[in-house]
Interface confidence: low
Amino acid sequence: FEIALPRESNITVLIKLGTPTLLAKPCYIVISKRHITMLSIKSGERIVFTFSCQSPENHFVIEIQKNIDCMSGPCPFGEVQLQPSTSLLPTLNRTFIWDVKAHKSIGLELQFSIPRLRQIGPGESCPDGVTHSISGRIDATVVRIGTFCSNGTVSRIKMQEGVKMALHLPWFHPRNVSGFSIANRSSIKRLCIIESVFEGEGSATLMSANYPEGFPEDELMTWQFVVPAHLRASVSFLNFNLSNCERKEERVEYYIPGSTTNPEVFKLEDKQPGNMAGNFNLSLQGCDQDAQSPGILRLQFQVLVQHPQNESNKIYVVDLSNERAMSLTIEPRPVKQSRKFVPGCFVCLESRTCSSNLTLTSGSKHKISFLCDDLTRLWMNVEKTISCTDHRYCQRKSYSLQVPSDILHLPVELHDFSWKLLVPKDRLSLVLVPAQKLQQHTHEKPCNTSFSYLVASAIPSQDLYFGSFCPGGSIKQIQVKQNISVTLRTFAPSFQQEASRQGLTVSFIPYFKEEGVFTVTPDTKSKVYLRTPNWDRGLPSLTSVSWNISVPRDQVACLTFFKERSGVVCQTGRAFMIIQEQRTRAEEIFSLDEDVLPKPSFHHHSFWVNISNCSPTSGKQLDLLFSVTLTPRTVDLT
């Protein structure tokens, strides 16, 4: 064999014994009849040698190191050659080493031609025996970036201050090219940047520098992932350790092009993002470690790139073609923590136009799909307007307030379904009749169903909320003077199972002057709690509401008020309450701004409770809570 190294080539060749084997017969390098076990050839030297055995590959290895100095002169950038050519070298296991030294301010980029690289962990080996070991430098300290095989996703590695690349080729491997080039870049202001390119579905396992040992203190390392826009990437941490930080925090940051909240910071113990569309960067940041007990920071993670999962391949048809004046919005439900990045969660129209919010309008059939790791992050809000413009046509007309089944079949939770019920002013009023009698939600007897009806005035200038009502009570109907909104609000996913309990009919009825009339038919078993509209804010000025309370023939009703005085202070007018027996028309009138409220009273027949407000002074509002309890007449009430 003859190896001649050109002068000024900065190449050193070293042939030395490899890992010792149990071969009985030793083997030597023979030069000028001398037998040696190590041979070093420097640039400008020419050496002729042979081996003393038939299979030197079982005994020796060869290292070819080229030092590239970018400190004192220009760098030889471009495609890196294998020098000397592999055909001129003895067939030993070969390691080509390129040691590039550069200024701190210079970025160096290794570019790998296809096939790209795949990082391997400790104890792993490459199937074809070809390995790339890459290390960097922080001042005088060598930092291992990682060991890589062929056939992966790593296309580029950027470093600063210097790079050492070792390409190990087994003696039998025919490779005669390095497979990479070097380019100069501006400062990257971090230890290194590893670019990983996905052409299609696949996964990559990557590790922090020095893995499984500790990541250098207070350093920053970035991975850039290039992912086709139609695919989704998810990150999972396979193994990590945290060091003991004295200052700052160890963390990972995600940078997603186009996101308005870059960079987004996660602790290593957090659940990492999934279902990210397109390119993204992940950075690992170390901290200032405790000098006495530093511990180690290390991270091994996997990026999985795949076609969107689960619901995303399902198409849902939302048929609103027979609906009028209706809009359905699918949107993110509010989350408390808003300084955290959460992976994208999108709803798509016709599988093409994807956004975090989507509004569908009536008159069409819509095809939608979802691109979301967790559909509980979305909810639906629906609005429908039922209006009457001609009182002659609408009177006595009824409409069913039901959530259409198309909407219930969507995989997203319904939050609100609001019906806006509009009537011609001073011509018609409305009556709501539930399929199942309703209970008014109060602190004393809260609703515990999976949904409620929220009834409020829909007149812009009027701040009037009648209350929240759920199935399973004593309210048989609610009559309201003018425009209202009725919102079915769900509180639990179990609404899907309880959907059959919903059912409200609205009818247009002749106009009446009171703001609202509640018809109550109490059950003998339970206490009925009722409260004035606008609880906590007070009944609006000059508003009048009534309760029509039925008492069966064999029962007695006990009417109880829950405070001694109403608390209202009138600026103008008077606030009063009338309790009137329906059979005899006998009535008691109480001045709410002066009198104490009545003590519990017993009623043998159906009766009215009417409450009318004055114009109260601010802060002294009218809020009343009362209950009705039925007991059999046979009980001695004395």
Epitope: K248, T261, N262, S283, Q285, K336, S338
Partner: antibody
């Protein structure tokens, strides 16, 4: 269009407390944090406190014992209260929108409200 | 607290020339690969206006005459070329650690 409008009493007697309201429009308090910064006449800027979108707060430790901040998301209002005012609390008080969730810079500022501490 | 020292306190520059304002932090304001240093412009009778965020990023709508550079403790705001409309006081601010502190300001005038 993003707008922040501060409203305050103008004149406060020494040892009394100060309440200022910042009413915002064009963005939601559930998405962005709001900072308070003050500037004494002819002097530089001093950061006081921030209330984040999730309701968490970060105070300037030097003033923490005298400051309190809260907000009403539905009314798009942020309230600053400062106790035990002295003449050196005389300043222009600004509220400002947090730029991005992670930068803690301030990209939109109100016109400020002048607070004079004098008997 | 991190103390921000701005130099010079005032600066007079001819129209069309370059203005350079320095800001030095008493400790590093870098975290996680980012410098949490921002620059504001304040004209008399007006609130401050964000020019540069995170040391070198130009806020949208701000002319490219303004640029920022630096890391860790030393930062620079450069205006090149200076225009008449740039007469104002310029402040640096760090947001790496609370309390988020401002520099004392640099008043820019035209020669």
């Amino acid at each position: 269009e993003v707008k922040l409008v501060e409203s305050g009493p103008g004149l406060v007697a020494p040892s009394q407390s100060l309440s200022i309201t910042c009413t915002v429009s064009g963005f939601s308090l559930t998405t962005y944090g709001v900072h308070w910064v003050r500037q004494p006449p002819g002097k530089g800027l001093e950061w006081l406190v921030v209330i984040w979108s999730d309701g968490n707060t970060t105070y300037n430790s030097a003033l923490k014992s005298r400051l309190s901040i809260n907000k009403d998301n539905s009314k798009s209002q942020v309230f600053l209260k400062m106790n035990s005012l002295q003449t050196d609390d005389t300043a222009m008080y600004y509220c400002a929108k947090n730029y991005r969730n992670y930068d803690y810079a301030m990209d939109y500022w109100g016109q400020g409200t002048t607070v004079t501490v004098s008997s | 607290d991190i103390v921000m020292t701005q130099t010079p306190a005032s600066l007079a520059v001819s129209l069309g020339q370059r203005a350079t304002i320095s800001c030095r932090a008493s400790e590093s304001v870098d975290s996680y690969g980012n410098s949490f240093m921002h620059w504001y412009q304040q004209k008399p009778g007006q609130p401050p206006k964000l020019l540069i965020y995170r040391a070198s990023n130009l806020e949208s709508g701000i002319p490219a005459r303004f640029s920022g550079s630096g890391s860790r403790t030393d930062f620079t705001l450069t205006i090149n070329p200076v225009e008449a409309d740039d007469v104002a006081t310029y402040y640096c601010q760090q947001s790496n650690e609370d309390p988020y502190t401002f520099g004392g300001g640099t008043k820019l005038e035209i020669k």
